[in-house]
């Protein structure tokens, strides 16, 4: 006869480990008992359980309520046991010893490996701003046994670097993702991918990139100066910019306060029916937490009653 077993039994922390010990012999051979023991190089052999053909299962006090036989139907020559709720301390060598008549004793050893799946965490780096050099976007840490694999999944161009720290029964892996921030990265996902044999599928944690920036400001509305004439209704100037965080807009007049009736609505300056009083230099101010910008335009309102007055060239800076 021979013993069928596994050299390595792998189980995830908290699950039940099936320790196989299957005697393949002739039908006239009788299995008297199957003895299970934990084999420790320092502490020697410690009895786990005894499966007796007549008296059933006896579990040693240290493993009470943790060792059992699979339920029937079972092959009478199957000496496998279940070790309930495996913990890291259960990792190590186990031995099953089968006593048969008349063939004698057979023994086999197996290693129990307890996988500890990681619980990854993602930490964003410092606030990203356009114009910075190579900056930490995020770091991702996962600890498990064996050491997990930590990688990044993203369309964003950058560099990743990993380091690991070994502990007595596990290893922590930290991977960092560095990039040169640009506004095109705004809203892009940066995903930390953690692989481990104790996970049914990769774990993914996604961080959405936020890059602070403020674009140059410009003013629209003066493209056709001939439209800016006395009596015209609905004339507007619009300040163009973009930024992250979204910028705030403000309008001023360089040569005095805004004329009465001129309304500021966010990025837009709305005029009442135009008069020559509306002529002047208007400044759009754009700001967010990162920076501020300004753009100015000169408005000249034409008076058809004054044919000597010519159109001045619009200036913008």
């Amino acid at each position: 006869g021979e013993l069928e077993t596994s050299d390595l039994v792998t189980v995830v922390l908290g699950q039940d480990a099936k320790l196989p010990c299957f005697y393949r012999g002739d039908p006239d051979e009788q299995v008297g008992q199957v003895a299970w023991a934990r084999v420790d190089p320092n502490e020697g052999t410690r009895e786990l359980a005894l499966l007796h053909s007549k008296y059933g299962l006896h579990v040693s006090p240290a493993y009470e309520d943790r060792v059992e036989q699979p339920p029937p139907p079972r092959d009478p020559l199957d000496g496998s046991i279940l070790l309930r709720n495996a913990v890291q301390a259960d990792e190590g060598e186990y031995e099953c010893r089968v006593s048969t008549f008349p063939a004698g004793s057979f023994q086999a050893r197996m290693r129990l490996r307890v996988l500890v799946p990681p619980l990854p965490s993602l930490n964003p780096g410092p606030p990203l701003e356009e114009g910075q050099g190579l900056t930490l976007a995020a770091s991702c840490t996962a600890e498990g046994s064996p050491a997990p694999s930590v990688t990044w999944d993203t369309e964003v161009k950058g560099t990743q670097s990993s380091r690991s720290f070994k502990h007595s029964r596990s290893a922590a892996v930290t991977s960092e993702f560095h990039l040169v921030p640009s506004r095109s990265m705004n809203g892009q996902p940066l995903t930390c991918v953690v692989s481990h044999p104790g996970l049914l599928q990769d774990q993914r944690i996604t961080h959405t990139l936020q890059v602070a920036f403020l674009a140059e400001a410009s003013v629209r509305g003066l493209e056709d100066q001939n439209l800016w004439h006395v009596g015209r209704e609905g004339a507007t100037l619009k300040c163009l910019s973009e930024g992250q965080p979204p910028p705030k807009y403000n309008w001023t007049r360089l040569d005095g306060p805004l004329p009465s009736g001129v309304r500021v609505k966010g990025d837009t300056l709305g005029f009442p029916p135009l008069t020559t009083e509306h002529s002047g230099v208007y400044v759009c101010h754009v700001s967010n937490e990162l920076s501020s910008r300004a753009s100015q335009v000169t408005v000249e309102v034409l008076d058809p009653e004054d044919p000597g007055k010519q159109v001045d060239l619009v200036s913008a800076s």
Epitope: D16, K18, R24, P71, D75
Partner: antibody, heavy 118, light 107 residues
Framework: QVQLKQSGPNLVQPSQSLSITCTVS????????AHWVRQSPGKGLEWLGV???????DYNAAFMSRLSITKDNSKSQVFFKMNSLQADDTAIYYC????????????WGQGTSVTVSS | DFQVTQSPASLSASVGETVTITCRTS??????LAWYQQKQGKSPQLLVY???TLADGVPSRFSGSGSGTQYSLKINSLQPEDFGTYYC?????????FGGGTKLEIK
């Protein structure tokens, strides 16, 4: 190589018994036991019972009262007998060798198609 | 009563695709699970035993995984000969029931 050849009737009268013989080659019944499984028309598979290498048996409780599985190691034969067949016992009956793990069915017979009808 | 729930009941896929079939059991079966393939008019064939171990002669594109009450059979890069019906079976407590089957058809 491993083979399981089944022989038995294709037609059984209601209330009569069904006997099927499974003759094996390529392995010994003293080393590997055998399962019996059936498959009803258009339905899935149903486990009926097992005979272990040592000769002991375990049956699906739903069939225990009318099922018997025995074997003759020297002739390499496993015998299946089911009593009191009814129309809903119409099925393909399979014998299958127990695999290396001691439970799964790693080789199957060709099946015996049995109709229960008068 | 002990339940084995296999899903999906049917699946349509193309050659080269990857498919996954799952089996859920009503209690922990500790990896005492096998997967079989059956083609029309033929006897079933063992693919995987002990939830994860590939049977002799089974191509490596088949793989079994899972633990506790949830198990999967994955077929990478489907080949024409892979089409048929797939069954899981547990060997935990009597009776050793089969899943209802998954019919895998060519798209």
């Amino acid at each position: 190589q491993v083979q399981l050849k089944q022989s038995g009737p294709n037609l059984v009268q209601p209330s009569q018994s069904l006997s099927i013989t499974c003759t094996v080659s390529g392995f010994s019944l003293t080393t590997y036991g055998a399962h019996w499984v059936r498959q009803s028309p258009g339905k899935g598979l149903e486990w009926l019972g097992v005979i272990w290498r040592g000769g002991s048996t375990d049956y699906n409780a739903a069939f225990m009262s009318r099922l018997s599985i025995t074997k003759d190691n020297s002739k390499s034969q496993v015998f299946f007998k089911m009593n009191s067949l009814q129309a809903d016992d119409t099925a393909i009956y399979y014998c299958a060798k127990i695999g290396y793990d001691g439970y799964a069915m790693d080789n199957w017979g060709q099946g015996t198609s049995v109709t229960v009808s008068s | 009563d002990f339940q084995v729930t296999q899903s999906p009941a049917s699946l349509s896929a193309s050659v080269g695709e990857t498919v996954t079939i799952t089996c859920r059991t009503s209690e922990n079966i500790h990896n005492y699970l096998a997967w079989y393939q059956q083609k029309q008019g033929k006897s079933p064939q063992l693919l995987v035993y002990n939830a994860k171990t590939l049977a002799d002669g089974v191509p490596s594109r088949f793989s079994g995984s899972g633990s506790g009450t949830q198990y999967s059979l994955k077929i990478n890069s489907l080949q024409p000969e892979d089409f048929g019906t797939y069954y899981c079976q547990h060997f935990w407590s009597s009776p050793w029931t089969f899943g209802g089957g998954t019919k895998l058809e060519i798209k």
